[in-house]
Interface confidence: medium
């Protein structure tokens, strides 16, 4: 299924720089392919735009969200609609175009430059160099020995999952990255599409544990779009 092809729990499929360098060894983050993106039940290229049926935002493209095409329309008939630009009305972040988010019902600029700079500074703090960036591989090869005498425990600051104890992964939380528990069966997980609003994701979840994948909770299939929960389920 598309869900299993795009199994993307928080620290997977995040675009750099916020998620880390694509393909960087030892990183818990990998970037999704940049050429194709999912639209409904098939892949479509960015320049081949047409509305596709959808059940949730994750099934649409980077510049789309999933909703009923008519105001007050049948909630059962939803398609991928073009994202809303700045100052347009919204009900959730996904409705706003990349670089914007939904605040008090209006799409506003996420001020990505400030936000990224703040996060980059935070993640590189342990090296004592506020000008380092996430792309600066040379400063990310080892953890500060002063900070880490052993593998990080739950809640401890980290740079990558290998810094964390068994059963934990390194994921963003607040304005840095910490060791969090790998998700167990039944726990809520996150599915992502590649969208500019990732810059706002200051909370990441770990991936599902071995033998589990992130899928829509079965009893939520009939629920409203906003309440569909993804949970870690057996393959």
């Amino acid at each position: 299924t598309l869900n299993s092809v795009l199994n993307s729990n928080a620290i997977k499929n995040l675009p750099p720089p916020l998620g880390g360098a694509a393909g960087h060894p030892g990183s818990a983050v990998s970037a999704a392919p940049g050429i194709l993106y999912p639209g409904g039940n098939k892949y479509q290229t960015i320049d081949n735009y047409q509305p596709y049926p959808c059940a949730e935002d994750e099934e649409c493209g980077t510049d789309e969200y999933c909703a009923s095409p008519t105001r007050g329309g049948d909630a059962g008939v939803q398609i991928c609609l073009a994202c809303r630009k700045r100052r347009k009305r919204c009900m959730r972040h996904a409705m706003c175009c990349p670089g914007n988010y939904c605040k008090n019902g209006i799409c506003v600029s996420s001020d990505q430059n400030n936000f990224r700079g703040e996060i980059e500074e935070t993640i590189t703090e342990s090296f004592g160099n506020d000008h380092s960036t996430l792309d600066g591989y040379s400063r990310r090869t080892t953890l500060s020995s002063k900070m880490y005498h052993s593998k990080g425990q739950e809640g401890s600051v980290c740079l990558r999952s290998s810094d964390c104890a068994t059963g934990l992964c390194c994921a963003r939380h607040f304005w840095s990255k910490i060791c969090k528990p790998v998700l167990k069966e039944g726990q809520v997980c996150t599915k992502h599409r590649r969208k500019g609003s990732h810059g706002l994701e200051i909370f990441q979840r770990c991936y599902c544990g071995e033998g589990l994948s992130c899928r829509i909770q079965k009893d939520h299939h009939q629920a409203s779009n906003s309440s569909r929960l993804h949970t870690c389920q057996r393959h």
Partner: antibody, heavy 116, light 112 residues
Framework: QVQLVESGGGLVQPGGSLRLSCAAS????????MSWVRQAPGKGLEWVSG????????HYADSVKGRFTISRDNSKNTLYLQMNSLRAEDTAVYYC?????????WGQGTLVTVSS | DIALTQPASVSGSPGQSITISCTGT?????????VSWYQQHPGKAPKLMIH???NRPSGVSNRFSGSKSGNTASLTISGLQAEDEADYYC???????????FGGGTKLTVLG
């Protein structure tokens, strides 16, 4: 086990200053963000400020911005809150909290009373 | 300002289940799908009961569970016990600027 102990509270006049301390033990203090949360008598919780593990990144609630300063001394495993230009509405119990998986450990709090 | 809205009080009898709601806006509860719940007994410090909307820290009874639908998060306590009587606060995060946001708190009374 994780322990957070606040101190430095007391009675102060409006416009005065006070410095709160929070002594941390039972965990690697330098690996965690920390924060201050306050609670006015009979009222709810209000987040005051947060500080990154090295101390170079700080965040404040609008209500205290420009008056309060959060800092830390990792060599002493201590978190501080310098409070200047205190107002009557700053009267509250001030808690320090570890920002692990959310605010996962809290101290017992120290009472700050601003009154003439 | 961003605010999280909770009922001022709820009550239930021992053994019953109760649910406390927490309604926010798109840039906190609804936007992040990330809510925490804290329990506070009179004169005591708050205690984290639920994080990430539905996950319990170790040591927290499985009678406590969290969920979220749209812009409303909920804390459910099943099999109410006398010691559950306390104030409960929901908490989320606003992004602009980044600040923690608490609900006004809900006083839970266990009857009888």
């Amino acid at each position: 086990q994780v322990q957070l102990v606040e101190s430095g509270g007391g009675l102060v006049q409006p416009g005065g200053s006070l410095r709160l301390s929070c002594a941390a033990s039972g965990f690697t203090f330098s690996s965690y963000w920390m924060s201050w949360v306050r609670q006015a008598p009979g009222k709810g919780l209000e987040w005051v400020s947060g500080i990154s593990y090295s101390g170079s990144n700080t965040h404040y609630a609008d209500s205290v911005k420009g008056r309060f300063t959060i800092s830390r001394d990792n060599s002493k495993n201590t978190l501080y809150l310098q409070m200047n230009s205190l107002r009557a509405e700053d009267t509250a119990v001030y808690y320090c909290a570890r920002m692990g998986i959310d605010l996962d450990y809290w101290g017992q709090g120290t009472l700050v009373t601003v009154s003439s | 300002d961003i605010a999280l809205t909770q009922p001022a009080s709820v009550s239930g009898s021992p053994g019953q289940s109760i649910t406390i709601s927490c309604t926010g806006t798109s840039s906190d509860v609804g936007g992040f799908n990330y809510v925490s719940w804290y329990q506070q007994h009179p004169g005591k410090a708050p205690k984290l009961m639920i994080h990430d909307g539905s996950n319990r820290p170790s040591g927290v009874s499985n009678r406590f569970s969290g969920s979220k639908s749209g812009n409303t998060a909920s804390l459910t306590i099943s099999g109410l016990q006398a010691e559950d009587e306390a104030d409960y606060y929901c908490q989320s995060w606003d992004v602009s600027p980044i600040t923690a946001v608490f609900g006004g708190g809900t006083k839970l009374t266990v009857l009888g």
